[in-house]
Interface confidence: medium
């Protein structure tokens, strides 16, 4: 890697990419943008899917954390030949199908969608696109939109979670590279550390969860700290404070020495979770220590 910014968050990332006729001469720039971005999400728990849409939506690469499959998926993406109409809603349908399936399998992993389009959507198609984006949201997804060239920012603000979730690229496709840093910063929700990482068995504590993107939730009142204890029971706690780079959370009382709590964060009241490799463990604390 080039030492640029990276994201350590464990969530499901869906790229929904416009491959309609109007991007025919710019597919290389779209591909390169996705490739650069994909390589910056580096958590082993991050899964990725590539979806393309024109007159139909196609899942080019199903959700996977396998880096070899992602490499092959990128190769398939590079071979795409654009053509057809801008049925963006079909892209969201393909994402929602996967989110729904994952939820039904008991995986409540947070989903982030990055949808890229150029040009304004015909009103009939915009109607469907916004509705399908809302369905993805109802399944717990956070939706970002990248608009290139002749896009309608008002439309994209309604398809995305808000106007703050829209990345306008006004200078054409070659300028896509310039927004990689800001997309990464905004779309990345990651848990980096917990302080303290060791707590006393049987005692109540507060934990500072360090990370990024905690205020990217549509509603910060719906942010939860989640503790998966010994890979079985999950306890959700409402944080005392939610800032972009940290959460202040009550830690569950872990009665026995050696117990482990894996830290997760939900941005939507427990509908789905950002996973991490951060573990809180218990130790014996003598009186007065």
């Amino acid at each position: 890697e080039d030492g640029g910014p990276a994201c350590y968050g464990g969530f499901d990332l869906y790229f929904i990419l416009d491959k309609s006729g109007s991007v025919l001469h710019h597919w290389n720039e779209i591909y390169y943008f996705v490739e650069q971005l994909a390589h910056r999400f580096i958590s082993p728990q991050l899964r990725m899917s590539f979806i393309v849409f024109s007159t139909r939506g196609t899942t080019l690469m199903k959700l996977t954390e396998d880096r070899e499959q992602i490499r092959q998926g990128l190769e398939e993406l590079q071979k795409v030949l654009p053509g057809g109409d801008t049925y963006m809603h079909e892209g969201f349908e393909r994402a929602s199908e996967q989110i729904y399936y994952e939820n039904s399998q008991g995986y409540r992993t947070a989903s982030v969608i990055i949808a890229l389009t150029d040009g304004e959507l015909h009103e009939d198609l915009f109607f469907y696109s916004e509705r399908e984006a809302n369905r993805s949201r109802d399944l717990g997804a956070i939706v970002y939109c990248v608009g290139v060239k002749d896009f309608n920012e008002t439309q994209l603000a309604r398809i995305a979670d808000s106007k703050d979730h829209v990345f306008p690229v006004n200078d054409g496709f070659q300028a896509l590279q310039g927004i990689i840093h800001s997309i990464l910063k905004k779309s990345c929700i990651e848990i980096l550390a917990a302080e303290p990482s060791t707590i006393c068995a049987g005692e109540s504590f507060q934990v500072v969860v360090r990370g990024n993107g905690f205020r990217h939730a549509r509603n910060v009142d719906r942010v939860l700290c989640s503790f998966k204890i010994n890979d079985s029971v999950t306890l959700n706690e409402k944080p005392f404070a939610v800032e972009d780079t940290y959460l202040l959370c009550p830690a569950p009382i872990l009665k026995e020495v050696g117990m482990k709590a894996a830290l997760q964060v939900s941005m939507n009241d427990g509908l789905s979770f950002i996973s991490s490799s951060v573990i809180i463990t218990t130790t014996h604390c003598s009186d007065g220590s």
Epitope: T55, R56, G84, D85, Y87, H122, E123, D124, L125, F126, F127, Y128, E130, R131, R158
Partner: antibody
Framework: QVQLVQSGPEVKKPGAPVKISCKTS????????ITWVRQAPGQGLEWLGW????????SFAQKVQGRLTMTTDISTNTASMELRGLRSDDTALYYC??????????????WGQGTLVTVSS | DVVMTQSPDSLAVSLGERATINCKSS????????????LAWYQQKPGQPPKLLIY???TRESGVPDRFSGSGSGTDFTLTISSLQAEDVAVYYC?????????FGGGTKLEIK
């Protein structure tokens, strides 16, 4: 003026396919979609499917998904539907209609005269 | 699927009187962005194909007499014939086009009392 003229009545045996055509005139064919609706004797209207004459996109009712094929021929401004594996409950008057919007199935502003399909052994 | 329920099933009204037909959808067919209700009304006379009367819940199709009007929003809609004429005897259907599959109401048969 806008006209949709359908092919004549059909009597078919169970399991056979039926193909109905719908010849249009009086408007630009690929500016509007075509939908197919049927009406069993003495019953209400049942939507079967829609095709975009502009890009071939289709949408089907679950009941006929897999049995219904819809096609369009821009050179003759004609839409067709084929329903395979006919059953007795497919006996109905089949209508084609012009759909407002070339992209998405909306309301139906002109209708064909209907084609009666009778399925009987 | 969006289920459309019409009431009453049949209706007898005197000539010159007002006729009111109701249609209820199982979910809202109002789209907030353009404030349009994705609902149409059709008239079907015996032995004829249906004919579009009203679209976007309240817009009259060209050539439709102004005694026909549509109203309502969200899930509840009404077709009103302000002064019934003999030629209005027919079955009337509502239809939603908010989402596929497109669905029709069961129909209301309008007769003269």
């Amino acid at each position: 003026q806008v006209q949709l003229v359908q092919s004549g009545p059909e009597v078919k045996k169970p399991g056979a396919p039926v193909k109905i055509s719908c010849k249009t005139s009086g408007y630009i064919f690929d500016d509007y979609g075509i939908t197919w609706v049927r009406q069993a004797p003495g019953q209400g209207l049942e939507w079967l499917g829609w095709i975009s004459t502009y890009n071939g996109k289709t949408s089907f009712a679950q009941k006929v998904q897999g049995r219904l094929t819809m096609t369009t021929d821009i050179s003759t401004n004609t839409a067709s539907m084929e329903l395979r594996g006919l059953r007795s409950d497919d006996t109905a008057l089949y209508y084609c209609a012009r759909v407002f919007s070339r992209y998405i199935p909306f309301y139906f502003d002109s209708w064909g005269q209907g084609t009666l399909v009778t399925v009987s052994s | 699927d969006v289920v459309m329920t019409q009431s009453p099933d049949s209706l007898a009204v005197s000539l010159g009187e007002r006729a009111t037909i109701n249609c209820k959808s199982s979910q809202s067919v109002l789209y907030s962005y353009n404030n349009k209700n994705y609902l149409a009304w059709y008239q079907q006379k015996p032995g004829q194909p249906p004919k579009l009367l009203i679209y976007w819940a309240s817009t009259r199709e060209s050539g439709v007499p102004d005694r026909f009007s549509g109203s309502g929003s969200g899930t509840d809609f009404t077709l009103t014939i302000s002064s019934l004429q003999a030629e209005d005897v027919a079955v009337y259907y509502c239809q939603q086009y908010y989402s596929t599959p497109l669905t029709f109401g069961g129909g209301t048969k309008l007769e003269i009392k």
